[in-house]
C-alpha cells in the first residue's frame, strides 16, 4: 500500500509568492511560493495519485505584515482552503499567547492541530481540551494512518505560551501516544512536529513504532540528486536514520516560507513496514501557475494589509537617526531602539534566579536602511519601519561561547572606517574599542549584563561561557562576514519578523525618545 | 467489488416516520463519509444529509434539518436516515453514496441504486 | 447557500458531436466542482471531480475546466450511450448544491 505525503513546514506567513530569497515577490515571473502557487501543485498530485496527505510541521505564524494584521485567521483560513489533513503546533503559534492561537486558529481549522507533548493545566485545561490533540488517527482510502504531534520543549523560551502549558520532553511523551495507537490496531503512524532536525533524527531513533518522521524549526533542506534552487542540503531526502529496533525510518523537512513543497512516497507492507521511501521536495517555482481561485481570494484579504501599513503605530520625539553614517560608524539611536525592541520581545520570567532568560543584542549596522524623522508629526507607520528594516528578516535567538561574541566585536571594527554593514549595534553590552590596536585586537572592554541576578548590572564577558543573545537571522548564518557566529554557535531559534518587533515595541511604549548612551564607546 | 444497497422506502401518510437503511461492501466503511441524496420525480438532485467517517459531524440542509437524523453502524457497515414528520414535498427517490476519508466536504464517487420514498394521505 | 446555475438546460446533438455544458458558482468554490451522469431510472453516476479530474473508469472523451464560478464539461465526439442529464455539484461548503441539470438529447 502505497501513501503519498505532502508536507511543508516554518511557512512564516509566506501567503502570497515571494522571491528567491522569500522576501516580498519584485518580479513576478520569478516568484516562488505562496499559497495560491501551492494549491495548483497539491491539486495536481491529489490528481494523480489515490492516497494522499497534505501535513504541516508547525510555525505557520509569524513573518509578514499578513500575521501581523490577521493574527493567525488567515492561516486558518488558506489551510482549509487548501484542505490540510493534519498540523503539529510550532513554537510560534503561541507568539500572541494562547489565547493568539485558540481563537484564529484552533476554533478555526477544520484539520486537527496536534501536540502529544503540550500538557495543559490549571483553568486552561477545561479551555483548550479538545481544541489540540495528541495524535489524530486519519483513514486514507482502506487503509488508517496515524499522526501523532510534537512541538519544541524550548517554547517557553521562543514565545508565549503563558504558565498553564507545560512543553515535555518530545520522546518521553511520544511514545505512550505511539504505544496507544498501536492498540487500536494503527500500524501505520506518522510523527508530525517541530523540534529541529535533530531531535527529529532522535525521534526516528527512539520511539518505537514511528514508521515516518515529518518535521520543521530548524529549516532542513534535504535533497537527492541536483538541488533546483539555492539552498545547499544537509542530507538526501529522505533522510534515513536507523532505530533503536532495526528500523529504517525515514526523515523529512521542506526547508521554509512555502518556498518548497515536501513529496515523499512510502510503500507499507500488509503489517504496516516501510517497504521502500523515495522521494523530493518539489520546488513551487513560476512554472506552476498560481490558482487563480485563491490568487482571487488572497488579493481580498490583501487590500487590509495596504490600509494597516500607513496607520500610526506610535511617536517618537526624537530623531531616529537610522543613516550609515551614524550606524556604521557609532552607536547609533536607531540601533539602541531596535535593540531594545529585540530584548523587550524576548522577556520571558525564567525563574527566580534570573530576571530574564536573555540580556544581549547584536545588531549589523548595515541592517539599519534608513532614518526616522521626528517632525512628521513623530507619527511612525509599518511603512516608515520596513524602509528601516526592508529585508524580510527574523531577530533570533542563539547560544554562543563569550569567546565567540569577543571574535565577533573584533569582526565588527576589523576595517573600520569603510562604511562597511558589519559593525555592531548592541543591547545589553558595553563595548570599547581602541581603533589604534591592530585589527583582530581592538576590543579592550566587553562588559554585559547579567541574567542570573535581581538587579541587572555589566559584568566583563567570560570566554568560555554560554551566552544567550538575540541578533538578526543574517547574523546566524554568517552574513556581513560573521562567519564565527555561524561556525561556532551552539543552538539557534528563529524568533519574530523584525519589523513586527520593533512595531509591537513602538505600540506597546506609545511614544519613544531613545537616546545614545555610551553603550559603544572608543578610548 | 463496492455496493451501497438502499432499503426501507415505501408510502407513508404525511406527518409520519421512516426509517431508510444503506447496507455497504466491498470498501471499508468506516473510512467514508455516507451521504443522502434525494431526487422528486422529474426533478434534479438535492442533498440531504452527510455523516463523517467517525460519526464525529453531521450536516443538513435547512429544508430537513430537525426532521432528519443521519446515522451510521460502522460495526454492521450499515448508514441509515431517519425520517421524522414527513410532508408531501419528501416524496422522492432517496439514494446512498459514498463521500471522501476527510471532514471536507465531498463529492460522491459511488451511489446506491436508490429507495422510493412516498409521502401521500 | 451557493448557487449552482447550469445551461442549457437542455440540448440536442448528434453522434460524434462536441458538446459544451456550463455551470456557475455563486460564489467562489476553488476547484471543489463535480459532475455526474444520470440516465433515466438510474442512480447517478460520478465522471469528475475537483473540477477537472476524470473519474476511474471514464471514457477520456469527457472533460472538465473551470475553477472559481465558471466551469465546463465538455464531450469531445458524443456517443450513443452518453444520451442522458449531466448534473454539477460543489463541495466547497455544506450544504452541497446540485445545477439543474442538463439533458442532452438526440437531434
Known amino acids: 500500500w502505497e501513501l503519498t505525503i505532502l508536507h511543508t513546514n516554518d511557512v512564516h506567513s509566506r501567503l502570497e509568492q515571494t522571491s528567491e530569497d522569500s522576501s516580498k515577490c519584485v518580479n513576478a515571473s520569478r516568484c516562488m511560493g505562496g499559497v495560491a502557487r501551492l494549491f495548483t501543485k497539491v491539486q495536481q498530485i491529489r490528481r494523480a495519485e489515490p492516497n494522499v496527505l497534505l501535513l504541516d510541521a508547525g510555525d505557520q505564524y509569524q513573518g509578514t505584515i499578513w500575521f501581523t494584521v490577521y493574527k493567525g485567521a488567515e492561516v486558518a483560513h488558506f489551510m482549509n482552503a487548501l484542505r490540510y489533513d493534519a498540523m503539529a503546533l510550532g513554537n510560534h503559534e503561541f507568539d500572541n499567547g494562547v489565547e493568539g492561537l485558540i481563537e484564529p486558529l484552533l476554533k478555526e481549522a477544520k484539520f486537527p492541530i496536534l501536540s502529544a507533548n503540550i500538557k495543559a493545566k490549571g483553568p486552561l485545561a477545561s479551555q483548550i481540551s479538545g481544541l489540540y490533540l495528541p495524535y489524530k488517527v486519519l483513514p486514507v482510502g482502506d487503509e488508517v494512518v496515524g499522526i501523532v504531534g510534537y512541538t519544541s520543549k524550548e517554547t517557553p523560551f521562543l514565545s508565549n505560551p503563558g504558565t498553564n502549558l507545560v512543553f515535555e520532553d518530545e520522546i518521553t511523551a511520544l511514545q505512550p501516544e505511539v504505544d496507544k495507537l498501536k492498540t487500536l490496531n494503527v500500524n501505520k503512524i506518522i510523527a508530525l512536529g517541530h523540534s529541529g532536525f535533530e531531535t527529529d533524527k532522535l525521534i526516528a531513533q527512539k520511539v518505537r513504532g514511528v514508521d515516518v518522521v515529518v518535521g520543521g524549526h530548524s529549516n532542513t533542506f534535504l535533497y537527492t540528486g541536483n538541488p533546483p534552487s539555492k539552498e545547499v542540503p544537509a542530507g538526501k531526502y529522505p533522510f534515513i536514520v536507523t532505530s533503536d529496533d532495526g528500523r529504517k525510518v525515514p526523515v523529512v523537512q521542506a526547508y521554509a516560507f512555502g518556498k518548497y513543497l515536501g513529496y515523499l512516497k512510502i510503500e507499507f507492507d500488509e503489517r504496516g513496514n516501510v517497504i521502500s521511501s523515495h522521494g523530493n521536495p518539489i520546488l513551487l517555482n513560476s512554472s506552476i501557475p498560481e490558482d487563480p481561485s485563491i490568487k482571487a481570494d488572497i488579493n481580498k484579504w490583501r487590500i487590509k494589509l495596504d490600509n494597516y501599513s500607513t496607520q500610526e503605530l506610535g511617536k517618537t520625539i526624537v530623531y531616529l537617526d537610522g543613516s550609515s553614517q551614524s550606524c556604521r560608524f557609532r552607536e547609533c539611536n536607531m540601533g539602541n531602539l531596535i535593540c531594545d525592541a529585540m530584548i523587550n520581545n524576548n522577556l520571558r520570567h525564567a525563574d527566580e534566579m534570573f530576571w530574564n532568560h536573555v540580556s544581549m543584542c547584536i545588531l549589523n549596522g548595515g541592517g539599519i536602511r534608513s532614518p526616522i524623522d521626528e517632525r512628521n508629526n513623530g507619527t511612525i507607520t509599518w511603512e516608515n519601519l520596513a524602509a528601516v528594516l526592508p529585508f524580510g528578516g527574523t531577530f533570533d535567538l542563539v547560544q554562543l561561547k563569550g569567546s565567540t561574541l569577543k571574535k565577533a566585536f573584533e569582526h565588527s571594527v576589523h576595517r573600520y572606517g569603510q562604511s562597511t554593514g558589519e559593525f555592531l549595534q548592541v543591547g545589553g553590552i558595553h563595548v570599547v574599542y581602541d581603533l589604534s590596536r591592530k585589527p583582530g585586537d581592538r576590543v579592550v572592554k566587553l562588559d554585559v549584563l547579567c541574567t542570573k541576578c535581581r538587579v541587572p548590572s555589566y559584568d566583563p564577558l567570560k570566554m568560555d561561557e554560554i551566552y544567550k543573545v538575540i541578533l538578526p537571522n543574517f547574523l546566524a548564518n554568517g552574513g556581513d562576514g560573521f562567519q564565527m557566529i555561524k561556525d561556532e554557535l551552539l543552538r539557534h531559534d528563529s524568533g519574530d519578523q523584525d519589523i513586527n518587533v520593533v512595531s509591537t515595541y513602538i505600540s506597546k511604549m506609545k511614544v519613544i525618545y531613545p537616546a545614545v548612551e555610551g553603550r559603544i564607546k572608543f578610548s | 467489488q463496492v455496493q451501497l444497497v438502499e432499503s426501507g422506502g415505501g408510502v407513508v401518510q404525511p406527518g409520519r416516520s421512516l426509517r431508510l437503511s444503506c447496507a455497504t461492501s466491498?470498501?471499508?466503511?468506516?473510512?467514508?463519509?455516507m451521504h443522502w441524496v434525494r431526487q422528486a420525480p422529474g426533478k434534479g438532485l438535492e442533498w440531504v444529509a452527510v455523516?463523517?467517517?467517525?460519526?464525529?459531524?453531521?450536516y443538513y440542509p435547512d429544508s430537513v434539518k430537525g426532521r432528519f437524523t443521519i446515522s451510521r453502524d460502522n460495526s454492521k457497515n450499515t448508514l441509515y436516515l431517519q425520517m421524522n414528520s414527513l410532508r408531501a414535498e419528501d416524496t422522492a427517490v432517496y439514494y446512498c453514496?459514498?463521500?471522501?476519508?476527510?471532514?471536507?466536504?465531498?463529492?460522491?464517487?459511488?451511489w446506491g441504486q436508490g429507495t422510493m420514498v412516498t409521502v401521500s394521505s | 447557500d451557493i448557487q449552482m446555475t447550469q445551461s442549457p438546460s437542455s440540448l440536442s446533438a448528434s453522434v460524434g458531436d462536441r458538446v459544451t455544458i456550463t455551470c456557475r458558482a455563486s460564489?467562489?468554490?476553488?476547484?471543489?466542482l463535480a459532475w455526474y451522469q444520470q440516465k433515466p431510472e438510474k442512480a447517478p453516476k460520478s465522471l469528475i471531480y475537483?473540477?477537472?479530474s476524470l473519474q476511474s473508469g471514464v471514457p477520456s472523451r469527457f472533460s472538465g475546466s473551470g475553477s472559481g464560478t465558471d466551469f465546463t464539461l465538455t464531450i469531445s465526439s458524443l456517443q450513443p450511450e452518453d444520451f442522458a442529464t449531466y448534473y454539477c455539484?460543489?463541495?466547497?461548503?455544506?450544504?452541497?448544491?446540485f445545477g439543474g441539470g442538463t439533458k442532452v438529447e438526440i437531434k
Open positions: 453514496a459514498r463521500g471522501g476519508s476527510s471532514w471536507y466536504p465531498d463529492s460522491f464517487d459511488i
Open positions: 466491498g470498501f471499508t466503511f468506516s473510512n467514508y463519509g
Open positions: 455523516i463523517l467517517y467517525d460519526g464525529s459531524n453531521k
Open positions: 460564489q467562489g468554490i476553488s476547484s471543489w
Open positions: 475537483a473540477a477537472s
Open positions: 455539484q460543489q463541495y466547497n461548503s455544506y450544504p452541497l448544491t
